[in-house]
């Protein structure tokens, strides 16, 4: 039903969002998560994993920087709100962003190899 | 904050399960009354693939698994006894159990920890 | 067996270089960050590096910064520093250490350490 | 950065005493603390980490508590072996940083 998330999935607040333990690069987190109909982690706010704030691991989430608009952006084309991370105008641009439930946030190479998270909206 | 699904407001869903992740420490017995008060029971785990999962989610937790000492076997909540190893068993003191990152350890039952609860749906 | 072989600590004099290397086996070295931490004589420890999984990514203590360069060999399961303009408050044992399962900030296993002695 | 000071910064105990060394964080770290035990000559060994997970192999007297800046390392019934100086570490953010240490001497 509309209200469920798929097996290994995590249902919170009207989202599903599936935690690897496996570690990938940037770029296969986010092919494994289209594959699986949703999309590398978008935060709406830092709160939004606070089920998991005690966790001590770093997540690659769906931001990327976008050299056209000059910003960084999610996945769906919205830009970074500036308050969600303070630190973000010392991130190299040219890296992805780990992300820990707890608010941290570091700028890594793409190519480095990290645990992700994907996020289906229910509804 | 939106709320959808078959948990409680705040409670997330896992494999058919609801769980409350708490971020209070308290005491076994402390923890025990706690989930009762929210009709559910202390965690518990059913197999290797839940206990990574917790384990991802917060590194240690109190679950429903205890003995009276350390002459008599460990036991579930509902009075069953416990298959799996509980690390350090052998000292005496230590008569509760904790989740401790994908590994079952005993604890001394005065500790506070932080508790999770669970309900099944 | 986890087991960390550091190798490459000398006496060097102000300004000199060296490489130190630490060669590593008893587990998949290409998934852990791996770190530097050094300790100077009769003192405590003092984290000096620590490079990401792939090496794709250095953070550095800001006494080594500019100075100092972390790489690693995946293909050896070697673990390199690079230790240029050094400085008399460099001497110290240097230790490498593999970052722990559950969060890489942690130091789980060490190697027995490297002497470095800056000196003229 | 993160300053990290422990007390006392030694102490004279008896085998089988109960002794407690704290930490504590110049801003709040959540849980992301580690400590260690360091013999003389001999690499640092890791005991606890998330602030009171206990590492595999390490002896189930040694216990960690504590979250937020104020942290506790507590050895419940001292062993010969354990007489070496201890090391509180931080991994919330970069630099990582460690306390000064504790050198726990035999009474």
């Known amino acids: 039903d509309c209200c469920s998330c798929q097996e290994k999935w995590v249902g919170y607040r009207c989202n599903c969002y599936f935690i690897s333990s496996e570690q990938k690069t940037w770029n296969e987190s986010r092919h494994l998560c289209a594959s699986q109909k949703s999309s590398l982690l978008q935060l709406q706010n830092t709160d939004e994993l606070d089920f998991m704030s005690s966790s001590q691991q770093f997540y690659w989430i769906g931001l990327s920087y976008s050299e056209e608009h000059t910003a960084w952006l999610w996945e769906n084309g919205s830009a970074l709100s500036q308050y969600l991370f303070p630190s973000f105008e010392t991130f190299n641009t040219k890296n992805c962003i780990a992300y820990n439930p707890n608010g941290n946030a570091l700028d890594e190479s793409c190519e480095d190899k990290n645990r992700y998270i994907c996020k289906q909206q229910l509804i | 904050a939106r709320h959808c699904g078959h948990c409680p407001e705040e409670w997330i869903t896992y494999s058919n399960s609801c769980y409350y992740i708490g971020k209070e420490r308290r005491t076994w017995e402390e923890s025990l009354l706690a989930c009762t008060s929210k009709n559910s029971s202390l965690l518990s785990i059913d197999n290797e693939e839940e206990m990574k999962f917790l384990s991802i989610i917060s590194p240690s937790s109190w679950i429903g698994v205890f003995r009276n000492s350390s002459h008599h076997p460990w036991v579930t909540m509902n009075g069953l006894a416990f298959k799996h190893e509980i690390k350090d068993s052998d000292n005496a003191e230590l008569n509760c159990a904790v989740l401790q990152v994908n590994r079952l350890k005993s604890a001394q039952c005065g500790s506070s920890i932080i508790y999770h609860c669970k309900h099944k749906l | 067996e986890v087991q960390l072989l550091e190798s490459g600590g000398d006496l060097v004099q102000p300004g000199g270089s060296l490489r130190l290397s630490c060669a590593a086996s008893g587990f998949t070295f290409d998934n852990y960050a791996m770190h530097w931490v050094r300790q100077a004589p009769g003192k405590g420890l003092e984290w000096v590096s620590t490079i990401t999984n792939s090496g794709g990514t250095t953070y550095y203590a800001d006494s080594v910064k500019g100075r100092f360069t972390l790489s690693r060999d995946n293909s050896k399961n070697t673990l390199y520093l690079q230790m240029n303009s050094l400085r008399a408050e460099d001497t110290a044992v240097y230790y490498c250490a593999k970052a722990h399962y559950y969060a890489r900030g942690y130091f789980d296993f060490w190697g027995q350490g490297t002497l470095v002695t800056v000196s003229s | 950065d993160i300053q990290m000071t422990q007390t006392p910064s030694s102490v004279s105990a008896s085998v089988g005493d109960r002794v407690t060394i704290t930490c504590r964080a110049s801003?709040?770290?959540?849980?992301?603390l580690a400590w260690y035990q360091q013999k003389p000559g001999k690499a640092p060994k890791l005991l606890i980490y998330?602030?009171?997970s206990l590492q595999s192999g390490v002896p189930s007297r040694f216990s960690g508590s504590g979250s937020g800046t104020d942290f506790t390392l507590t050895i419940s019934s001292l062993q010969p072996e354990d007489f070496a100086t201890y090391y509180c570490q931080q991994a919330n953010s970069f630099p990582y940083t460690f306390g000064q240490g504790t050198k726990l001497e035999i009474k």
């Open positions: 998330a602030a009171s």
């Open positions: 801003q709040g770290i959540s849980s992301w």
